[in-house]
């Protein structure tokens, strides 16, 4: 099939001791090969500080996956989710302030 770019959605949820879990979800993409990683100041976080979900079919002939990490509250601006898929790429910020969701569809 033809390439379908991912929808990327960044969310954050508060956890204890001033840390936040940030999750980057990529969905509705094809083919299944994708790079999804958290960056701090543009530098990829080490593998042992990130948790990845499997790349799974989402039932529409496309795929979905996610990556999560924990960051210190107040440092959200330093972090972005980096995505590469079928020659396209993008960086996606952690939502700031009261906005806890960020959606972006790649074209």
């Amino acid at each position: 099939g033809s390439t379908v770019p991912p929808m990327v959605n960044v969310t954050c949820s508060e956890v204890s001791e001033g840390n936040i879990t940030v999750t980057c979800r990529a969905s509705s993409f094809y083919p299944r090969n994708i790079t999804l990683t958290w960056r701090q100041d543009g530098v990829s976080l080490s593998h042992n500080t990130q948790q990845w979900g499997d790349v799974l079919p989402d039932g529409n002939g496309t795929y979905q996956t996610w990556v999560a990490t924990r960051i210190r509250q107040g440092e959200e601006q330093r972090f972005t989710c980096y995505m590469e898929h079928s020659g396209n790429h993008g960086t996606h910020p952690v939502p700031s302030g009261n906005s806890h969701h960020h959606h972006h569809h790649h074209h």
Epitope: Q40, D41, G42, V43, S44, L45, S46, T49, Q77, R78, T80, Y82, E84, H89, G90, T91, H92, P93
Partner: antibody, heavy 118, light 108 residues
Framework: EVQLVQSGAEVKKPGASVKVSCKAS????????IYWVRQAPGQGLEWIGY????????IYNQQFKDRVTITADTSTSTAYLELSSLRSEDTAVYYC???????????WGQGTLVTVSS | EIVLTQSPATLSLSPGERATLSCSAS???????LHWYQQKPGQSPRLLIY???NLASGVPARFSGSGSGTDYTLTISSLEPEDFAVYYC?????????FGQGTKVEIK
């Protein structure tokens, strides 16, 4: 081959502004941050700030944020550093650098000497 | 701000000798955020070691890095003539990003 090519040396008077450019090639410009660092004569390295060209996010070293503006033009793969209200202490070589996969500064421009003198 | 203090300021050695450069941080840093750069006169800095102990592309195996917490070390096992330069450590864990003041390795 990744290359960062900076604009030429500048001589400025105190109180003036200077704008230094950094043209990137050999990679997808919007996939990496561009950092700016300066080095006064005979001194060490000092981080000024960076820009994520994809989303336009800029993070400044608070020490510089009142006088520095970092921008990027994705159509020409060029980043810019503008420093205003120049003083003699701003005399330095200004470097642009690209963020790497595993380190903050993996490729560097050749540097631009800015001399502030009356 | 995390202050990085490098010692010694100058190291005078002969080719073939071992060089040990230290970098001490004012606060603890994750080893993932400590990097080393080499700068020769009139040149831009060059990434040497990333994440404490990993050699950057094209860097000879005589260079090595180690450390954790607040104390980090760059070692050159046997100095070659092209190794005489200034070496900087840098931390990327906290803003502002900071560099050490440098250690100059000069020919004795």
């Amino acid at each position: 081959e990744v290359q960062l090519v900076q604009s030429g040396a500048e001589v400025k008077k105190p109180g003036a502004s200077v704008k230094v450019s950094c043209k990137a090639s050999g990679y997808a410009f919007t996939s990496n941050n561009i950092y700016w660092v300066r080095q006064a004569p005979g001194q060490g390295l000092e981080w000024i700030g960076y820009i994520d060209p994809y989303i336009g996010r800029i993070i400044y070293n608070q020490q510089f944020k009142d006088r520095v503006t970092i921008t990027a033009d994705t159509s020409t793969s060029t980043a810019y550093l503008e420093l205003s209200s120049l003083r003699s202490e701003d005399t330095a070589v200004y470097y642009c650098s690209r963020s790497g996969e595993r380190s903050n500064f993996d490729y560097w421009g050749q540097g631009t000497l800015v001399t502030v003198s009356s | 701000e995390i202050v990085l203090t490098q010692s010694p300021a100058t190291l005078s050695l002969s080719p073939g000798e071992r060089a040990t450069l230290s970098c001490s941080a004012s606060s603890s840093i994750s080893s993932n955020y400590l990097h080393w750069y080499q700068q020769k006169p009139g040149q831009s800095p060059r990434l040497l070691i990333y994440r404490t102990s990993n050699l950057a592309s094209g860097v000879p195996a005589r260079f090595s890095g180690s450390g954790s917490g607040t104390d980090y070390t760059l070692t050159i096992s046997s100095l070659e003539p092209e190794d005489f330069a200034v070496y900087y450590c840098q931390q990327g864990g906290s803003l502002p990003l900071t560099f050490g003041q440098g250690t100059k390795v000069e020919i004795k």
